[in-house]
């Protein structure tokens, strides 16, 4: 079957890195500069991705694979294959349409990306605030006065930070 297909379609013999050139009797021609074909039997080569501006080249384009980009310092990747770069902020801030803005009172962000999240409400667990929260750090909850007994654990660390929002759809 493979041999029959090859006889019927000479293009199926063209390997990755080449294309089936209709202008030259369907012979396999190498992909031109700045283009690639990652699979065999292609009738055209795809244009290589250019990593410019905020995008840096992580992997150069070759005749058989596309370039890969990442983001310049101060930015981080979003989307499949780093299709976008998003600005970093300082800890204690979040990114908005108006740039990096400080977290509002009662919220914090301990990362350079993502959103400000509310401080843990210690009283919901019947605990008291042992260490106050800041823009950069969550509160630390301690035992309620009634819980203070010999051998009792004195500090409950806050729940681990979840990955913040701002992820692409």
């Amino acid at each position: 079957f493979e041999r029959t297909r090859s006889l019927q379609d000479p293009c199926s013999n063209c390997p990755a890195g080449t294309f089936c050139d209709n202008n030259r009797n369907q012979i396999c021609s190498p992909c031109p500069p700045n283009s690639f074909s990652s699979a065999g039997g292609q009738r055209t080569c795809d244009i290589c991705r250019q990593c410019k501006g905020v995008f840096r080249t992580r992997k150069e384009c070759s005749s058989t694979s596309n370039a890969e980009c990442d983001c310049t310092p101060g930015f981080h990747c979003l989307g499949a294959g780093c299709s976008m770069c998003e600005q970093d902020c300082k800890q204690g801030q979040e990114l908005t349409k108006k740039g990096c803005k400080d977290c509002c009172f009662g919220t914090f962000n301990d990362q350079k990306r993502g959103i400000c999240r509310p401080w843990t409400n210690c009283s919901l667990d019947g605990k008291s605030v042992l260490v106050n929260g800041t823009k950069e750090r969550d509160v630390v909850c301690g035992p309620s006065p009634a819980d203070l007994s010999p051998g009792a654990s004195s500090v409950t660390p806050p729940a681990p930070a979840r990955e913040p929002g701002h992820s692409p759809q």
Epitope: G53, V54, L78, G79, S83, M84, C85, E86, Q87, L95, T96, K97, H166, S167, P168, Q169
Partner: nanobody
């Protein structure tokens, strides 16, 4: 091909003015937020200004507020940055960029950038 091309950079004296332009092609310009960023020598890339699809929302980094004005002409597929009262610290490569699909609903990322135009402020 989706493309952004900046122009209008050059050498200008402190206190002077320049107008940068960015021509867009290969996509529906009026559907996207647009940006100016800059990179001063030896420094990280910095957001300068952004504008929404119809030009009704504009935002600036504090250091250029009141001196720079971002605008767009959707009929001409063009973005502009009018820079007045220029200072030595405005010396940088200025880049035009497009907000990614879904910008401000789910992220604040950019996906298409120009090659940049150089602005030098010096006496």
């Amino acid at each position: 091909e989706v493309q952004l091309v900046e122009s209008g950079g050059g050498l200008v004296q402190p206190g002077g003015s320049l107008r940068l332009s960015c021509g867009a092609s290969g996509f529906t310009f009026s559907s996207y937020w647009m940006f100016w960023f800059r990179q001063a020598p030896g420094k990280e890339l910095e957001w300068v200004a952004n504008v929404n699809q119809d030009g009704s929302e504009k935002y600036y980094v504090d250091s250029v507020e009141g001196r720079f004005t971002i605008s767009r002409d959707n009929a001409k597929n063009s973005l502009y940055l009018q820079m007045n009262s220029l200072r030595a610290e405005d010396t940088a490569i200025y880049y035009c960029a497009r907000g990614g699909e879904g910008y401000s609903d789910s992220h604040y990322g950019t996906d298409v950038w120009g090659q940049g135009t150089t602005v030098t402020v010096s006496s």
